[in-house]
């Protein structure tokens, strides 16, 4: 912590400008009052301070505003946001985007960092909800947003901000948290016709049952392998060698270079040999013909 | 609830064939939900896939051990056997049976046997 | 083969402590990846499965997550019992483990 000393004669400063790059810390600390400071944050982000100035201004806002900053200083925070920890930002009550967005602007490029996460928690539970408008910007500054969400988090997502997400979006997603964007996303897209349908479905179907699977087989939709590899395990596996042909339509050739791989391989291994080889795709290891095919799964959670 | 038990020889001669059964009880190997597989681990290292059965008889092995794997499975006794020819020094491990749940993973595991390739 | 580089190989780590695993597959291997626990003289114990999914009887203090082609297993506040080797697997392809992560008491 800087010591208290009495700032020198006609070094008090009356505004925030770029003489105050040549103040040593304890003239900082000495010579420029905190509410300036406040009135004039916009100014701090266009003077090349160094990190230890920017400690000394962080320690007059926090002697200033010990509650936590008012956001009209929280907006032209700039570079010295760098600066706040966890801690202090948990202290703020962020309320308008375009904040969100100054402060996200400030660490753009670099990967979401402990203060970043904070911040948009607050701001995300200051809202209620994850909102179309929010969605948009925190995707566009961190494409991997959704996916860092838990599954509980993401059930606040009102399924009118699926709008918003890109495939790229949901690269990084697991399993359970495609179970609760799928239902969001089918609800969102529902009015649209069967091929823009498929479209926008597409990057969610991660989290597809086999029920919507067989139904989209019906439509002509030609899945491509790389979505089909992204299918639920347990989706996939229900599906007949009928069903399959139907969903990849020209893409089924795809399926022999995917056969050593999941959840191609646990799928061949169900299928019929007969039924395999109806595809002509030279596909191996299905059930031989004459035998017995059985499913003792649900007897053996039940004994 | 499904128990799985390793059972062979302890001591195999270089060049000799390793051979080990699993035993299955308190379920059923004709179960499409799993595959029956054999995994080692040497001393004070890490864990290798050898390689696993469906139980209409597909296998899938290790590429650098396919050439001397077999691993078959006998419905009828609820066991899966694994044998490992022309072994050496270097294939003393602890041999483990296991349950692989397509939906999950490795999920019931033998207690594991140990196997020393010593002349 | 897909190869899974796991890190560290050892960490020293008191009760009450945050641990963190990683594991990184040389290929996309979607959410294929499960964790083990090992103790001494043991077999091992499924934790996680499709990367972040918790095992049955398995303690939420222990949770998997992914990023592409890097898993992470985190034990949010480690307990006595939690001191072990730990294991990544895919299981895209044939199946393949990390190296291990020794769990010591600091």
């Known amino acids: 912590e800087v010591e208290k000393t009495a700032c020198p004669s006609g070094k008090k400063a009356r505004e925030i400008d770029e003489s105050l790059i040549f103040y040593k810390k304890w003239e900082l600390e000495a010579c420029v009052d905190a509410a300036l400071l406040a009135t004039q944050m916009d100014r701090v982000n266009a003077i090349p301070f160094t990190y230890e100035q920017l400690d000394v201004l962080k320690h007059k806002l926090d002697e200033l505003y010990p509650q936590g900053y008012p956001e009209s200083v929280i907006q032209h925070l700039g570079y010295l946001f760098l600066k706040m920890s966890p801690e202090d930002i948990r202290k703020w009550n962020v309320t308008s985007l375009e904040t969100l967005k100054a402060l996200l602007e400030v660490n753009k490029g670099h990967e979401m960092s402990p203060q970043v996460a904070t911040l948009i928690d607050r701001f995300v539970k200051g809202r209620g909800q994850l909102d179309k408008d929010t969605l948009d910007t925190l995707t566009a500054f961190y494409p991997g947003y959704l996916c860092s969400l838990s599954p509980e988090e993401l059930s606040s997502v009102p399924p009118s901000s699926i709008w918003a997400v890109r495939p790229q979006d949901l690269d990084t997603c697991d399993p359970r948290q495609l179970d609760v964007l799928y239902p969001k996303a089918r609800l969102a897209f529902q009015n649209m016709n069967g091929s823009e349908y498929f479209v926008k479905i597409q990057s969610f179907l991660g989290g597809a049952p086999t029920e919507d699977l067989k139904a989209l087989s019906q439509q002509n939709v030609s899945m491509d392998l790389a979505t089909f590899m992204k299918l639920r395990t347990d989706a996939v596996l229900p599906l007949t060698v009928a069903e399959v042909q139907k969903l990849l339509g020209p893409h089924v050739e795809g399926l022999k270079a995917e056969e050593r791989h999941r959840p191609v391989r646990d799928w061949i291994l169900r299928q019929r040999q007969d039924d395999l080889d109806t595809l002509g795709l030279g596909l191996q290891g299905g059930i031989p013909n004459g035998y017995l095919v059985l499913d003792l799964s649900m007897q053996e959670a039940l004994s | 609830q499904v128990q799985l038990q390793e059972s062979g020889p302890g001591l195999v001669k270089p060049s000799q064939t390793l051979s080990l059964t699993c035993t299955v009880s308190?379920?059923?190997?004709?179960?499409?939900?799993?595959?029956w597989t054999w995994i080692r681990q040497h001393p004070g290292k890490g864990l290798e896939w050898i390689g696993y059965i469906y139980y209409s008889g597909s296998t899938f092995y290790n590429p650098s051990l396919k050439s001397r794997v077999t691993i078959s499975v006998d419905t009828s006794k609820t066991q899966f056997s694994l044998k490992l020819s022309s072994v050496t020094a270097a294939d003393t491990a602890v041999y483990y049976c296991a349950r692989e749940d397509t939906m999950t993973g490795l999920d019931v595991w033998g207690q594991g046997t140990t196997v020393t390739v010593s002349s | 083969d897909i190869q899974m580089t796991q890190s560290p190989s050892s960490l020293s780590a008191s009760v009450g402590d945050r641990v963190t695993i990683t594991c990184r597959a040389s290929?996309?291997?979607?959410?294929?990846l499960n964790w083990y626990q090992q103790k001494p003289g043991k077999a091992p114990t499924l934790l996680i499965y499709?990367?972040?999914s918790l095992q049955s009887g398995v303690p939420s203090r222990f949770s998997g997550s992914r990023s592409g082609t890097d898993f992470t297993l985190t034990i949010s506040s480690l307990q006595p019992e939690d001191f072990a080797a730990y294991f990544c697997q895919q299981t895209y392809s044939n199946p393949t483990f990390g190296q291990g992560t020794k769990v010591e008491v600091k």
């Open positions: 308190g379920g059923s190997i004709n179960n499409n939900n799993y595959y």
């Open positions: 499709a990367a972040s």
């Open positions: 290929q996309s291997i979607n959410n294929y």
